[in-house]
């Protein structure tokens, strides 16, 4: 699609993955497309098969080692290439030098648990995942509380601007059930963004005692 | 604002050598992969070629790979088209334009567009 828009994203993980979506106005939903990535200074390369996630969008993961191991940093640069098969050749269809640093995604907290409910209040905590030491505490994170009655998107976004991986939820209802998520991302990079939103927590407050106003 | 400015184009005879060169006012081009287009009389923009700025890497068409080759100058902040054995065909209005992460072949990819320059291959 020469004159089609296409659109090729990746982010990293902080770690050892990059992630990528190339998406393509008119392309054939069984074209075969790899994404290949030559860091400027290391090694190894990498490659990984685009796989269809919609009409005309393909996604892969570029596993570069070990889930905790520090692949990459603030200097390298991986120049990522997307190659579509074409008859019995390979054409290389878009290019990107990619900083890793720019363009960061972390991966979504996990651990999640409630660590004391009450009536009104419930602290939550919860770790990051695969996350570089880098970082230090240059990290911030968004929750939301999904009440009874109503959506995710209707949920208020609480914001913290500091690495804490905690957080007291108050003026809740007695014996009410809520959910909560969490999403982290840290404060470096042009292009980075938030990570995925945590799984839910499902949790549910104290009933009030019997014959004491709320 | 990336403002782009071509500039280099003209009269060859075919097979002559042209070098197109394209420079930025407003911001440094150096932030931006760079792509070169063209119209031919009567016909739709096409791609030519297109370059990453930091490792150079490079995207030809097939009509002009081998004959055509593009480069950048950090020093002189300018992205230039080599353009050598050029035949009647090549004649057209060559555009500069800067995308803001990656090179393809497809001009919607592109964000900041030049006025163009006008090549025009005739004996």
């Known amino acids: 699609a020469v004159n089609g828009t296409s659109q090729f994203t990746c982010f990293y993980n902080s770690r050892a993955n990059i992630s990528c979506v190339w998406s393509q106005d008119g392309a054939l939903q069984d074209t075969s497309c790899q994404v290949h990535a030559w860091p400027d200074r290391r090694r190894w390369n990498q490659t990984c098969e685009l796989l269809p996630v919609s009409q005309a969008s393909w996604a892969c993961n570029l596993i570069l080692g070990a889930p905790d191991s520090q692949k990459l940093t603030t200097v390298d640069i991986v120049t990522l290439r997307v190659l579509c098969r074409e008859g019995v050749r390979w054409r290389v269809m878009a290019i990107q030098d990619f900083k890793p640093f720019e363009n960061l995604r972390l991966m979504a907290p996990i651990s999640l648990q409630v660590v004391h409910v009450e009536t009104h209040r419930c602290n939550i905590s919860w770790e990051i995942s695969q996350a570089s030491h880098y970082f230090e505490r240059h990290l911030e994170f968004e929750a939301r509380t999904l009440s009874p009655g109503h959506t995710w998107e209707e949920a208020p976004l609480l914001t913290l601007k500091q690495k804490q991986e905690w957080i007291c939820l108050e003026t809740l209802t007695p014996d009410t059930q809520y959910e909560f998520q969490v999403r982290v991302k840290p404060l470096q990079g042009e292009f980075t963004t938030w990570s995925p939103w945590s799984q839910p927590l499902a949790f549910r407050t104290k009933p009030a005692a019997l014959g004491k106003d709320t | 604002q990336l403002q782009l400015v071509e500039s280099g184009g003209g009269l060859v005879q075919p097979g002559g050598s042209l070098r197109l060169s394209c420079a930025a006012a407003?911001?440094?081009?150096?932030?931006?992969?760079v792509g070169w287009f063209r119209r031919a009389p009567g016909k739709e923009r096409e791609f030519v070629a297109a370059?990453?700025?930091?490792?150079?890497?490079?995207l030809y068409a097939d009509s002009v790979k081998g004959r055509f080759t593009i480069s950048r100058d950090n020093a002189k902040n300018t992205v230039y088209l080599q353009m050598s054995s050029l035949k009647p065909e090549d004649t057209a209005l060559y555009y500069c334009?800067?995308?803001?992460?990656?090179?393809?072949?497809?001009?919607?990819?592109?964000?900041?567009w030049g006025q163009g320059t006008q090549v025009t291959v005739s004996s």
């Open positions: 334009a800067a995308a803001l992460k990656t090179i393809t072949r497809g001009q919607n990819d592109y964000s900041y």
């Open positions: 407003g911001r440094a081009i150096e932030n931006y992969p």
């Open positions: 370059i990453t700025w930091i490792s150079g890497s490079t």
